[in-house]
Amino acid sequence: CDLPQTHSLGNRRALILLGQMGRISPFSCLKDRHDFRIPQEEFDGNQFQKAQAISVLHEMIQQTFNLFSTEDSSAAWEQSLLEKFSTELYQQLNDLEACVIQEVGVEETPLMNEDSILAVRKYFQRITLYLIERKYSPCAWEVVRAEIMRSLSFSTNLQKRLRRKD
Protein backbone atom coordinates (compact mmCIF):
# COMPACT_ATOMS: atom_id res chain seq x y z
CA CYS A 1 0.00 0.00 0.00
CA ASP A 2 1.41 3.36 -0.99
CA LEU A 3 0.30 6.13 1.33
CA PRO A 4 -0.78 9.00 -0.91
CA GLN A 5 1.33 12.16 -1.03
CA THR A 6 -1.74 13.95 0.32
CA HIS A 7 -1.33 11.93 3.53
CA SER A 8 2.11 13.43 4.07
CA LEU A 9 0.80 16.91 3.32
CA GLY A 10 -2.07 16.30 5.73
CA ASN A 11 0.40 15.43 8.45
CA ARG A 12 2.31 18.64 7.77
CA ARG A 13 -0.94 20.64 7.81
CA ALA A 14 -1.90 19.02 11.13
CA LEU A 15 1.46 20.05 12.59
CA ILE A 16 1.03 23.63 11.35
CA LEU A 17 -2.49 23.83 12.80
CA LEU A 18 -1.30 22.44 16.13
CA GLY A 19 1.45 25.04 16.08
CA GLN A 20 -1.14 27.78 15.63
CA MET A 21 -3.39 26.54 18.42
CA GLY A 22 -1.39 27.97 21.33
CA ARG A 23 -3.35 30.44 23.44
CA ILE A 24 -0.78 31.46 26.04
CA SER A 25 2.95 32.11 25.89
CA PRO A 26 4.75 28.79 26.44
CA PHE A 27 7.46 30.79 28.24
CA SER A 28 5.19 30.94 31.28
CA CYS A 29 4.92 27.14 31.40
CA LEU A 30 8.54 26.05 31.75
CA LYS A 31 8.00 24.63 35.24
CA ASP A 32 5.14 22.44 33.93
CA ARG A 33 7.41 20.35 31.70
CA HIS A 34 6.92 16.64 32.17
CA ASP A 35 8.53 13.41 31.02
CA PHE A 36 5.82 11.49 29.17
CA ARG A 37 8.39 8.86 28.13
CA ILE A 38 7.60 8.94 24.42
CA PRO A 39 8.09 5.38 23.05
CA GLN A 40 10.72 6.44 20.50
CA GLU A 41 11.60 2.88 19.52
CA GLU A 42 8.06 2.49 18.18
CA PHE A 43 8.82 5.19 15.63
CA ASP A 44 11.96 3.47 14.38
CA GLY A 45 10.72 2.10 11.06
CA ASN A 46 13.81 -0.09 10.60
CA GLN A 47 12.69 -2.71 13.11
CA PHE A 48 9.18 -3.09 11.70
CA GLN A 49 7.54 -4.73 8.76
CA LYS A 50 5.41 -2.27 6.84
CA ALA A 51 2.10 -3.55 8.23
CA GLN A 52 3.38 -3.13 11.78
CA ALA A 53 4.59 0.41 11.15
CA ILE A 54 1.27 1.39 9.59
CA SER A 55 -0.68 0.03 12.59
CA VAL A 56 1.59 1.97 14.98
CA LEU A 57 1.02 5.13 12.93
CA HIS A 58 -2.72 4.47 12.94
CA GLU A 59 -2.76 4.04 16.72
CA MET A 60 -0.74 7.21 17.18
CA ILE A 61 -3.13 9.30 15.04
CA GLN A 62 -6.20 7.64 16.58
CA GLN A 63 -5.05 8.43 20.12
CA THR A 64 -4.22 12.02 19.12
CA PHE A 65 -7.67 12.35 17.57
CA ASN A 66 -9.29 10.99 20.75
CA LEU A 67 -7.28 13.34 22.98
CA PHE A 68 -8.35 16.41 21.02
CA SER A 69 -11.99 15.28 20.71
CA THR A 70 -12.78 15.56 24.42
CA GLU A 71 -14.93 18.25 26.03
CA ASP A 72 -11.88 19.46 27.97
CA SER A 73 -10.01 19.90 24.72
CA SER A 74 -12.90 21.86 23.19
CA ALA A 75 -12.76 24.24 26.14
CA ALA A 76 -8.99 24.68 25.80
CA TRP A 77 -8.57 25.51 22.12
CA GLU A 78 -9.97 27.88 19.51
CA GLN A 79 -12.85 26.00 17.95
CA SER A 80 -12.23 26.55 14.23
CA LEU A 81 -8.54 25.55 14.50
CA LEU A 82 -9.47 22.51 16.58
CA GLU A 83 -12.04 21.43 13.98
CA LYS A 84 -9.55 21.82 11.12
CA PHE A 85 -6.94 19.87 13.11
CA SER A 86 -9.43 17.05 13.84
CA THR A 87 -10.45 16.94 10.16
CA GLU A 88 -6.82 16.49 9.08
CA LEU A 89 -6.37 13.68 11.61
CA TYR A 90 -9.62 12.03 10.50
CA GLN A 91 -8.47 12.06 6.86
CA GLN A 92 -5.17 10.49 7.87
CA LEU A 93 -7.00 7.79 9.79
CA ASN A 94 -9.00 6.94 6.67
CA ASP A 95 -5.81 6.70 4.57
CA LEU A 96 -4.13 4.51 7.17
CA GLU A 97 -7.17 2.27 7.66
CA ALA A 98 -7.23 1.48 3.95
CA CYS A 99 -3.55 0.60 4.16
CA VAL A 100 -3.93 -1.51 7.31
CA ILE A 101 -6.59 -3.66 5.61
CA GLN A 102 -4.44 -4.03 2.49
CA GLU A 103 -1.16 -4.76 4.29
CA VAL A 104 -2.53 -7.18 6.89
CA GLY A 105 -3.78 -9.29 4.02
CA VAL A 106 -0.18 -9.50 2.76
CA GLU A 107 1.61 -10.07 6.07
CA GLU A 108 0.60 -11.75 9.28
CA THR A 109 1.10 -9.14 12.02
CA PRO A 110 3.10 -10.74 14.85
CA LEU A 111 2.46 -10.27 18.57
CA MET A 112 5.35 -7.80 18.70
CA ASN A 113 2.99 -5.33 17.04
CA GLU A 114 0.53 -5.64 19.92
CA ASP A 115 3.34 -4.60 22.27
CA SER A 116 4.03 -1.54 20.12
CA ILE A 117 0.39 -0.51 20.04
CA LEU A 118 0.17 -1.04 23.81
CA ALA A 119 3.24 1.19 24.27
CA VAL A 120 1.54 3.98 22.28
CA ARG A 121 -1.68 3.56 24.30
CA LYS A 122 0.23 3.73 27.61
CA TYR A 123 2.02 6.86 26.39
CA PHE A 124 -1.34 8.56 25.79
CA GLN A 125 -2.60 7.32 29.16
CA ARG A 126 0.35 9.13 30.77
CA ILE A 127 -0.56 12.29 28.87
CA THR A 128 -4.22 12.05 29.96
CA LEU A 129 -3.23 11.39 33.58
CA TYR A 130 -0.94 14.44 33.52
CA LEU A 131 -3.83 16.62 32.28
CA ILE A 132 -6.11 15.27 35.01
CA GLU A 133 -3.45 15.84 37.70
CA ARG A 134 -2.92 19.40 36.47
CA LYS A 135 -6.68 19.98 36.30
CA TYR A 136 -6.52 20.68 32.56
CA SER A 137 -4.73 23.99 33.23
CA PRO A 138 -3.73 26.19 30.26
CA CYS A 139 -0.05 25.38 30.90
CA ALA A 140 -0.75 21.64 31.09
CA TRP A 141 -2.46 21.83 27.69
CA GLU A 142 0.46 23.89 26.35
CA VAL A 143 2.92 21.19 27.47
CA VAL A 144 0.73 18.49 25.92
CA ARG A 145 0.46 20.47 22.67
CA ALA A 146 4.30 20.65 22.51
CA GLU A 147 4.53 16.92 23.23
CA ILE A 148 2.00 16.00 20.51
CA MET A 149 3.85 18.19 18.01
CA ARG A 150 6.95 16.21 18.87
CA SER A 151 5.24 12.82 18.48
CA LEU A 152 3.56 13.88 15.22
CA SER A 153 7.02 14.86 13.95
CA PHE A 154 8.26 11.37 14.84
CA SER A 155 5.35 9.82 12.97
CA THR A 156 6.05 12.06 9.95
CA ASN A 157 9.63 10.75 9.93
CA LEU A 158 8.37 7.16 10.16
CA GLN A 159 6.13 7.78 7.13
CA LYS A 160 9.12 9.14 5.19
CA ARG A 161 11.08 5.99 6.02
CA LEU A 162 8.16 3.83 4.91
CA ARG A 163 8.04 5.61 1.55
CA ARG A 164 11.77 5.09 1.10
CA LYS A 165 11.27 1.35 1.70
CA ASP A 166 8.79 1.12 -1.20
Epitope: S25, P26, L30, K31, D32, R33, E142, R150
Partner: antibody, heavy 121, light 107 residues
Protein backbone atom coordinates in the same frame (compact mmCIF):
# COMPACT_ATOMS: atom_id res chain seq x y z
CA UNK B 1 24.61 17.15 12.13
CA UNK B 2 23.14 19.86 14.37
CA UNK B 3 25.04 23.14 14.17
CA UNK B 4 24.63 26.70 15.37
CA UNK B 5 26.96 29.03 13.49
CA UNK B 6 27.41 32.57 14.77
CA UNK B 7 28.58 35.66 12.91
CA UNK B 8 32.15 36.88 13.29
CA UNK B 9 33.79 39.10 15.91
CA UNK B 10 32.84 42.78 15.94
CA UNK B 11 34.71 45.90 17.06
CA UNK B 12 32.45 48.89 17.61
CA UNK B 13 32.43 52.35 19.13
CA UNK B 14 30.12 53.40 21.99
CA UNK B 15 26.75 54.57 20.68
CA UNK B 16 26.89 52.45 17.52
CA UNK B 17 24.29 49.82 16.67
CA UNK B 18 24.98 46.14 16.08
CA UNK B 19 23.15 42.97 15.07
CA UNK B 20 24.81 39.57 15.46
CA UNK B 21 23.40 36.32 14.09
CA UNK B 22 23.09 32.62 14.87
CA UNK B 23 22.20 30.24 12.03
CA UNK B 24 20.80 26.82 12.85
CA UNK B 25 21.15 23.75 10.65
CA UNK B 26 20.71 19.98 10.86
CA UNK B 27 17.41 20.16 12.74
CA UNK B 28 13.93 21.69 12.53
CA UNK B 29 14.70 25.29 13.44
CA UNK B 30 11.14 26.11 14.53
CA UNK B 31 10.96 23.10 16.86
CA UNK B 32 13.47 24.59 19.30
CA UNK B 33 13.84 27.92 21.04
CA UNK B 34 17.08 29.89 20.75
CA UNK B 35 18.58 31.40 23.87
CA UNK B 36 21.34 34.03 24.16
CA UNK B 37 24.00 33.98 26.88
CA UNK B 38 26.57 36.66 27.71
CA UNK B 39 30.03 36.06 29.13
CA UNK B 40 32.00 39.14 30.07
CA UNK B 41 35.83 38.82 30.08
CA UNK B 42 36.93 36.47 32.87
CA UNK B 43 33.37 36.15 34.21
CA UNK B 44 30.57 33.61 34.33
CA UNK B 45 27.54 32.89 32.14
CA UNK B 46 24.50 35.18 32.14
CA UNK B 47 21.22 34.31 30.43
CA UNK B 48 19.95 37.25 28.37
CA UNK B 49 16.76 36.01 26.78
CA UNK B 50 15.15 33.54 24.43
CA UNK B 51 13.04 33.37 21.28
CA UNK B 52 10.59 30.85 19.86
CA UNK B 53 11.38 31.05 16.12
CA UNK B 54 8.02 29.53 15.18
CA UNK B 55 6.18 32.73 16.16
CA UNK B 56 8.98 35.10 17.30
CA UNK B 57 7.64 35.16 20.87
CA UNK B 58 10.43 36.40 23.19
CA UNK B 59 11.30 36.44 26.89
CA UNK B 60 14.10 38.52 28.42
CA UNK B 61 16.04 38.49 31.65
CA UNK B 62 15.08 41.64 33.62
CA UNK B 63 18.78 42.63 33.51
CA UNK B 64 18.68 42.78 29.70
CA UNK B 65 15.10 43.88 29.04
CA UNK B 66 15.17 47.10 27.02
CA UNK B 67 18.94 46.82 26.48
CA UNK B 68 18.86 44.32 23.60
CA UNK B 69 16.39 42.95 21.07
CA UNK B 70 16.13 39.29 20.12
CA UNK B 71 14.56 38.39 16.78
CA UNK B 72 14.46 35.54 14.29
CA UNK B 73 13.86 34.85 10.62
CA UNK B 74 12.59 31.29 10.35
CA UNK B 75 12.79 31.37 6.53
CA UNK B 76 16.59 31.38 6.82
CA UNK B 77 16.82 29.54 10.19
CA UNK B 78 18.56 32.47 11.85
CA UNK B 79 18.20 34.19 15.21
CA UNK B 80 19.56 37.65 15.99
CA UNK B 81 20.70 39.69 18.94
CA UNK B 82 20.86 43.45 18.46
CA UNK B 83 21.80 46.68 20.22
CA UNK B 84 20.67 50.14 19.17
CA UNK B 85 23.35 51.95 21.16
CA UNK B 86 26.36 50.02 22.40
CA UNK B 87 28.21 50.75 25.65
CA UNK B 88 31.75 49.80 26.69
CA UNK B 89 30.16 47.44 29.26
CA UNK B 90 28.64 45.42 26.37
CA UNK B 91 32.14 44.09 25.62
CA UNK B 92 31.72 40.33 25.98
CA UNK B 93 31.44 36.97 24.27
CA UNK B 94 27.87 36.23 23.21
CA UNK B 95 26.65 32.68 22.71
CA UNK B 96 23.45 31.32 21.21
CA UNK B 97 22.17 27.90 22.24
CA UNK B 98 19.11 25.83 21.36
CA UNK B 99 16.46 24.95 23.93
CA UNK B 100 13.79 22.21 23.55
CA UNK B 101 10.96 24.47 24.64
CA UNK B 102 8.32 22.64 26.67
CA UNK B 103 9.53 19.20 25.59
CA UNK B 104 11.27 16.94 28.07
CA UNK B 105 14.67 17.01 26.41
CA UNK B 106 18.11 18.41 27.22
CA UNK B 107 18.26 22.20 27.65
CA UNK B 108 20.93 24.10 25.69
CA UNK B 109 22.33 20.91 24.18
CA UNK B 110 23.99 22.68 21.24
CA UNK B 111 25.81 26.00 21.37
CA UNK B 112 27.18 28.41 18.80
CA UNK B 113 30.92 29.07 18.78
CA UNK B 114 30.38 32.53 20.24
CA UNK B 115 30.66 36.07 18.87
CA UNK B 116 33.15 38.38 20.54
CA UNK B 117 31.87 41.96 20.70
CA UNK B 118 34.39 44.66 21.64
CA UNK B 119 33.12 48.17 22.31
CA UNK B 120 35.85 50.75 22.65
CA UNK B 121 36.36 54.38 21.74
CA UNK C 1 14.77 35.40 40.44
CA UNK C 2 16.19 32.07 41.55
CA UNK C 3 19.78 32.44 42.80
CA UNK C 4 22.25 29.63 42.18
CA UNK C 5 25.29 29.30 44.45
CA UNK C 6 28.15 26.96 43.62
CA UNK C 7 30.88 25.74 45.93
CA UNK C 8 33.78 25.74 45.93
CA UNK C 9 34.54 28.57 43.50
CA UNK C 10 37.79 26.79 42.62
CA UNK C 11 39.56 23.58 43.54
CA UNK C 12 42.87 21.88 42.83
CA UNK C 13 42.90 18.16 42.12
CA UNK C 14 45.07 15.47 40.57
CA UNK C 15 44.35 13.07 37.72
CA UNK C 16 42.42 10.10 39.12
CA UNK C 17 40.87 12.07 41.99
CA UNK C 18 37.17 11.99 42.76
CA UNK C 19 35.83 15.52 42.50
CA UNK C 20 32.54 16.85 43.87
CA UNK C 21 31.00 20.24 43.09
CA UNK C 22 27.84 21.42 44.80
CA UNK C 23 25.14 23.81 43.70
CA UNK C 24 22.42 25.30 45.87
CA UNK C 25 19.23 26.98 44.63
CA UNK C 26 17.56 29.80 46.58
CA UNK C 27 14.23 27.94 46.28
CA UNK C 28 13.12 24.45 45.36
CA UNK C 29 13.60 23.70 41.67
CA UNK C 30 12.70 20.00 41.71
CA UNK C 31 15.10 18.32 39.31
CA UNK C 32 15.23 21.22 36.84
CA UNK C 33 19.00 21.59 37.00
CA UNK C 34 21.69 21.34 34.32
CA UNK C 35 25.49 21.15 34.52
CA UNK C 36 27.86 22.55 31.88
CA UNK C 37 31.61 22.34 31.32
CA UNK C 38 33.51 25.20 29.73
CA UNK C 39 37.11 25.23 28.60
CA UNK C 40 39.00 28.49 27.91
CA UNK C 41 38.02 30.05 24.58
CA UNK C 42 35.29 27.47 23.97
CA UNK C 43 31.50 27.41 24.22
CA UNK C 44 29.94 25.66 27.23
CA UNK C 45 29.10 21.99 26.81
CA UNK C 46 26.07 20.31 28.39
CA UNK C 47 27.06 17.43 30.71
CA UNK C 48 23.99 16.65 32.84
CA UNK C 49 20.37 17.66 32.40
CA UNK C 50 17.37 17.32 34.72
CA UNK C 51 19.77 16.87 37.65
CA UNK C 52 20.94 13.34 36.85
CA UNK C 53 20.52 12.51 33.14
CA UNK C 54 23.83 12.12 31.32
CA UNK C 55 23.92 13.98 28.02
CA UNK C 56 24.65 11.81 24.97
CA UNK C 57 28.39 11.48 24.31
CA UNK C 58 29.45 12.55 27.82
CA UNK C 59 31.75 10.04 29.63
CA UNK C 60 30.11 8.02 32.41
CA UNK C 61 32.63 9.30 34.97
CA UNK C 62 30.38 12.38 35.17
CA UNK C 63 27.25 12.03 37.28
CA UNK C 64 24.69 14.34 38.81
CA UNK C 65 22.46 13.98 41.82
CA UNK C 66 20.14 15.95 44.03
CA UNK C 67 16.69 17.49 43.94
CA UNK C 68 14.91 20.43 45.48
CA UNK C 69 17.60 22.91 46.48
CA UNK C 70 20.83 20.88 46.76
CA UNK C 71 22.65 19.34 43.83
CA UNK C 72 25.98 17.67 43.19
CA UNK C 73 28.17 17.08 40.15
CA UNK C 74 30.66 14.25 40.63
CA UNK C 75 33.63 13.30 38.47
CA UNK C 76 34.52 9.80 39.65
CA UNK C 77 38.09 9.78 38.31
CA UNK C 78 39.41 13.10 37.05
CA UNK C 79 41.03 12.98 33.60
CA UNK C 80 43.45 15.54 32.07
CA UNK C 81 40.70 16.81 29.73
CA UNK C 82 38.38 17.52 32.69
CA UNK C 83 40.31 20.56 33.89
CA UNK C 84 37.80 23.31 33.12
CA UNK C 85 35.13 25.53 34.68
CA UNK C 86 31.80 23.96 35.60
CA UNK C 87 28.47 25.78 35.83
CA UNK C 88 25.09 24.74 37.20
CA UNK C 89 21.91 26.29 35.77
CA UNK C 90 18.35 26.20 36.99
CA UNK C 91 15.82 25.33 34.29
CA UNK C 92 12.63 25.72 36.32
CA UNK C 93 11.64 29.22 35.33
CA UNK C 94 12.63 32.42 33.58
CA UNK C 95 14.94 34.19 34.02
CA UNK C 96 17.19 31.14 33.69
CA UNK C 97 20.12 31.56 36.08
CA UNK C 98 23.61 30.08 36.29
CA UNK C 99 25.87 29.47 39.25
CA UNK C 100 29.04 31.58 39.37
CA UNK C 101 31.18 28.63 38.23
CA UNK C 102 33.72 26.26 39.76
CA UNK C 103 37.20 26.20 38.26
CA UNK C 104 38.89 22.79 38.46
CA UNK C 105 42.66 23.23 38.29
CA UNK C 106 45.61 20.85 38.25
CA UNK C 107 47.22 20.35 41.66
Amino acid sequence: EVQLVQSGAEVKKPGESLKISCKGSGYSFTSYWIGWVRQMPGKGLEWMGIIDPSDSDTAYSPSFQGQVTISADKSISTAYLQWSSLKASDTAMYYCARHPGLNWAPDFDYWGQGTLVTVSS
Amino acid sequence: DIQMTQSPSSLSASVGDRVTITCRASQSIGDFLNWYQQKPGKAPKLLIYFASSLQSGVPSRFSGSGSGTDFTLTISSLQPEDFATYYCQQALDFPLTFGQGTKVEIK
